[in-house]
């Protein structure tokens, strides 16, 4: 457990930019939590560099990260989940840079899954449903979800809808008829815990019905 690098130490190492970012995932593997860190500069020579977390841990002073190609990773039950930990980039016993981080403020949820869209002919709408592993978790249970959809031909014209449930209704009249749509969803912590958006779920593709000329309504596919 060593402090910050002193001036004059580490010679050339001090000239490099060792800034890094981290995210935590709670109960990602049963009751195990994970912490993932990576350098912001992809060109940093990571050969002799290690990451260490100290403080706000259960019955240990510090834990060392495992290196997995370009990222550094810990999986453990030993996070207190309160207060700030000291996360340091180290070469040997010397700390090159350190950050104090509260792991409850850098939570990245797991991506939602099982996204599907069902057309309801009688209601003239589409019911979007998806699942999240967080419904079963003890900690990060309350999430805000961001459902994004677009007409497949409109590459960057995404429409976003924020919701706290895992079900959304899209009105048929708000969508173009006889069009192919792509839809996806991601999540972010929304109560007590803070952090980042999850990865996007796999996209789901669906086609809107044609308009029925006599009634002005869309035909089911």
């Amino acid at each position: 457990e060593s402090g910050y690098a002193q001036n004059g130490d580490l010679e050339d190492a001090e000239l490099d930019d060792y800034s890094f970012s981290c995210y935590s995932q709670l109960e990602v593997n049963g009751s195990q939590h994970s912490l993932t860190c990576a350098f912001e500069d992809p060109d940093v020579n990571i050969t002799n560099l290690e990451f260490e977390i100290c403080g706000a841990l259960v019955e240990v002073k510090c834990l060392n990260f495992r290196k997995l190609q370009e990222i550094y990773f810990i999986e453990t039950k030993k996070f207190l989940l309160i207060g700030k930990s000291n996360i340091c980039v180290k070469v040997g016993e010397k700390s090159l840079t350190c950050k104090k981080i509260d792991l409850t403020t850098i939570v990245k949820p797991e991506a939602p899954f099982d996204l599907s869209v069902v057309y309801r002919e009688g209601a003239n709408d589409f019911v979007v449903t998806f699942n999240t592993s967080h419904l079963q978790k003890k900690y990060v249970k309350v999430l805000m979800h961001d459902v994004a959809y677009r007409q497949e031909k409109d590459e960057n014209k995404w429409t976003h809808v924020n919701l706290s449930s895992t079900k959304l209704t899209l009105l048929q009249r708000k969508l173009q008829p006889a069009a192919m749509y792509e839809i996806k969803v991601r999540s972010i912590p929304d109560h007590y815990f803070k952090g980042f958006w999850s990865e996007w779920s796999p996209s789901y593709y669906f086609r809107t019905p044609e308009i029925n000329n006599s009634s002005g309504e869309m035909d089911p596919i």
Partner: antibody
């Protein structure tokens, strides 16, 4: 005003067990760890353990594992320390102390509970 | 487990005198805290994270150090400073030093 109010002094026989309470007021109880510290002979301070009131996660000094058990009642903002199988070595003043999670020092202390173990 | 050794164990200082109390760690410590305790009362946070003064602590107090050597300094001793001072490491298992008793000469 942030305060930690501890239960009163105790005189106990060897082999007995007892529970000290520490009622917190004036702050968000679940936002800080609650720590327990033993002071023997008016001098030596020893950290016993802590509890995160938000989730009940505990961390103990190895020396006090099996001797002390930490719990909380969130509804009443009260922390408890149970001391088991008391001996004369457990005679001491016991403090609860709020842990500042930014710097990991004990920023607010209770007045202490004197425990005397004697036959 | 880190051992914190405070020196001197007891010291006496005249009013107005500069006082330095040291805390030596058996291995490197990132941050050190200091507490003041007067007879019959609970410890009070005095200096945290090496050099930050706790609320209400007079500016004649200062803290410094790194690695295995830390110190608390009083620039000019006053009567109310007579007390026992404890150092404490910031991390598990939050070990305290044995204390330095500061008296008035």
């Amino acid at each position: 005003e942030v305060q930690l109010q501890q239960s009163g002094p105790e005189l106990l026989k060897p082999g007995a067990s007892m529970k000290i309470s520490c009622k917190a007021s004036g702050y968000s109880f679940t936002g800080y760890t609650m720590n327990w510290v033993k002071q023997s002979h008016g001098k030596n301070l020893e950290w016993i353990g802590l509890i995160n009131p938000y989730n009940g996660v505990t961390s103990y000094n190895q020396k006090f594992k099996g001797k002390a058990t930490l719990t909380v009642a969130k509804s009443s903002s009260t922390a408890y320390m149970e001391l088991l199988s008391l001996t004369s070595e457990d005679s001491a003043v016991y403090y609860c102390a709020r842990g500042d999670g930014n710097y990991w020092y004990f920023d607010v202390w209770g007045a202490g509970t004197t425990v005397t173990v004697s036959s | 487990e880190i051992v914190l050794t405070q020196s001197p164990a007891i010291t006496a200082a005249s009013l107005g005198q500069k006082v330095t109390i040291t805390c030596s760690a058996s291995s490197s410590v990132t941050y050190m805290h200091w507490y003041q305790q007067k007879s019959g009362t609970s410890p009070k946070p005095w200096i945290y994270e090496i050099s930050k003064l706790a609320s209400g602590v007079p500016v004649r107090f200062s803290g410094s150090g790194s690695g295995t050597s830390y110190s608390l300094t009083i620039s000019s001793m006053e009567a109310e400073d007579a007390a026992i001072y404890y150092c404490q490491e910031w991390n598990y298992p939050y070990t305290f030093g044995g204390g330095t008793k500061l008296e008035i000469k």
